[in-house]
C-alpha cells in the first residue's frame, strides 16, 4: 500500500471512529434497566452520561439531566472525563492530520514536516481511542458491579414494610452506546496506528544509500568531500540537491526528470 493511501485510509478510519466517540458520548443508552415486575406498567429505564430517561409501554418518555455533579458516582465522572479527553484529542488529531495529508499541499511544507505531523496525529488518535475504550469499559464494569450489588437490599425502619427502603431488582443490560463506544474507540486506535505506519514511509530514509548517476561532462570531475553523504539523503536539507556542478544527482531527482540526463 502506498504511503498516501495508508495515510488517507488512516485518516478516514480515525474520522469515522472519532464521529462514533462523539455519538457514544452524547447517547442516552449507556445502560438500560427493564422493570419487568412493575405492578402498574412496563417501565424501560435508560441512562447516559448526562441524563436519565424513562419510557413506558404507553409511549410516554421523559428524560432528565444530571444537573449536579454532587451525588453522582465517581465512576460516572471519570467516564465523562475520559470521553471528553478522547474527543478533545481527536479534534486536535484531525486538525493536525488535515495539514499532514500528503495529497494536500500547503505552502512549501516538506515531507519531513508532514511526517512529523502524521506521527503526531497518529499518536493523538491512538490516545483518543484508548481513552474511549477505557471509558466505556469502566462504565461496563460499573454496571456489572451494580448488577451483583443490587441483590443486597437496603432496609431502614422497624419491621413490616413501614418506612422501608430497598433496591428494586432490575435487569441491567449494556446500552447501545457501549458497543458504539467500543467500536469507535477501536477504529480511532486502528486509524492512529495506520497514520504512524504512514509516517515511516514519509520520513526520508536514513539507512539506505541512494544511487547516484553521472553523465559524461567532458571534463574531469573531482570528488567533493561529503558529497556521498549528501547523496545518501542524510538530513532533510540535502535531499534532492545537486552534488556536483558537473552532474551527479540523487535518485529522487532522476525520477522527477528521467529524460534530462545521459546515463553511464
Amino acid at each position: 500500500m502506498s504511503v498516501t493511501a495508508c495515510q488517507g485510509l488512516g485518516f478516514v478510519v480515525s474520522l469515522i471512529g472519532f464521529a462514533g466517540i462523539i455519538a457514544a458520548t452524547c447517547m442516552d443508552q449507556w445502560s438500560t434497566q427493564d422493570l419487568y415486575n412493575n405492578p402498574v406498567t412496563a417501565v424501560f429505564n435508560y441512562q447516559g452520561l448526562w441524563r436519565s430517561c424513562v419510557r413506558e409501554s404507553s409511549g410516554f418518555t421523559e428524560c432528565r439531566g444530571y444537573f449536579t455533579l454532587l451525588g453522582l458516582p465517581a465512576m460516572l465522572q471519570a467516564v465523562r472525563a475520559l470521553m471528553i479527553v478522547g474527543i478533545v484529542l481527536g479534534v486536535i488529531g484531525i486538525l493536525v492530520s488535515i495539514f499532514a495529508l500528503k495529497c494536500i499541499r500547503i505552502g512549501s511544507m516538506d515531507d519531513s514536516a508532514k511526517a512529523k505531523m502524521t506521527l503526531t496525529s497518529g499518536i493523538l488518535f491512538i490516545i483518543s481511542g484508548i481513552c474511549a475504550i477505557i471509558g466505556v469499559s469502566v462504565f461496563a464494569n460499573m454496571l456489572v458491579t451494580n448488577f451483583w450489588m443490587s441483590t443486597a437490599n437496603m432496609y431502614s425502619g422497624m419491621g413490616g414494610m413501614g418506612g422501608m427502603v430497598q433496591t428494586v431488582q432490575t435487569r441491567y443490560t449494556f446500552g447501545a452506546a457501549l458497543f458504539v463506544g467500543w467500536v469507535a474507540g477501536g477504529l480511532t486506535l486502528i486509524g492512529g496506528v495506520m497514520m504512524c505506519i504512514a509516517c515511516r514511509g514519509l520520513t526520508p530514509d536514513d539507512s539506505n544509500f541512494k544511487a547516484v548517476s553521472y553523465h559524461a561532462s567532458g571534463q574531469n570531475v573531482a570528488y567533493r568531500p561529503g558529497g556521498f553523504k549528501a547523496s545518501t539523503g542524510f538530513g532533510s536539507n540535502t535531499r534532492n540537491k545537486k552534488i556536483y556542478d558537473g552532474g551527479a544527482r540523487t535518485e529522487d531527482d532522476e525520477q522527477s526528470h528521467p529524460t534530462k540526463y545521459d546515463y553511464v
Epitope: S31, L35, S52, S58, F60, E62, G71, P73, T167, T170
Partner: nanobody, 121 residues
C-alpha cells in the same frame, strides 16, 4: 435518602369519602411509579391502585369504580380519592414509590409508615 409520608387516614362512616395523600421528600431525582397498597389485620398486602409517571393507572378489581388515583409529578405527591367506602376497606394504607437514584445508578423502592383507614358500618 428518599422518604414517603402518608396522610389523610382516619375513622369514617360506610358510604362516605376519604382522600389520602402521599408526599415524597429527600434527594429525589425522579419518581417513576407510585402506588397505594393496603394490609388488613391477618391478611396479605395487596395493591389498591398504582400510577406511572406518564399517568398510566391500575386498580384492584374490588375498588375499580370507587377509588381514583392521581399524582402531581412536580410536587412528587400522589393522591387516592376513596368514595363509597365499605367496611372491607378497613386496613393500613401504605404508599409505595419507585425512584431512580443517580448516586447509585439503581432503582429504590420506598415504603411509607402507613396510615390507618377504619370504616364503621
Amino acid at each position: 435518602e428518599v422518604q414517603v409520608q402518608e396522610s389523610g387516614g382516619g375513622l369514617v362512616q360506610a358510604g362516605t369519602s376519604l382522600r389520602l395523600s402521599c408526599a415524597a421528600s429527600g434527594n429525589i431525582f425522579r419518581i417513576d411509579t407510585m402506588g397505594w397498597y393496603r394490609q388488613a389485620p391477618g391478611k396479605q398486602r395487596e395493591l389498591v391502585a398504582g400510577i406511572s409517571r406518564g399517568g398510566t393507572t391500575t386498580y384492584a378489581h374490588s375498588v375499580k369504580e370507587r377509588f381514583t388515583i392521581s399524582r402531581d409529578n412536580a410536587k412528587n405527591t400522589m393522591y387516592l380519592q376513596m368514595n363509597s367506602l365499605k367496611s372491607e376497606d378497613t386496613a393500613g394504607y401504605y404508599c409505595n414509590a419507585q425512584a431512580w437514584d443517580p448516586g447509585t445508578f439503581r432503582y429504590l423502592e420506598v415504603w411509607g409508615q402507613g396510615t390507618l383507614v377504619t370504616v364503621s358500618a
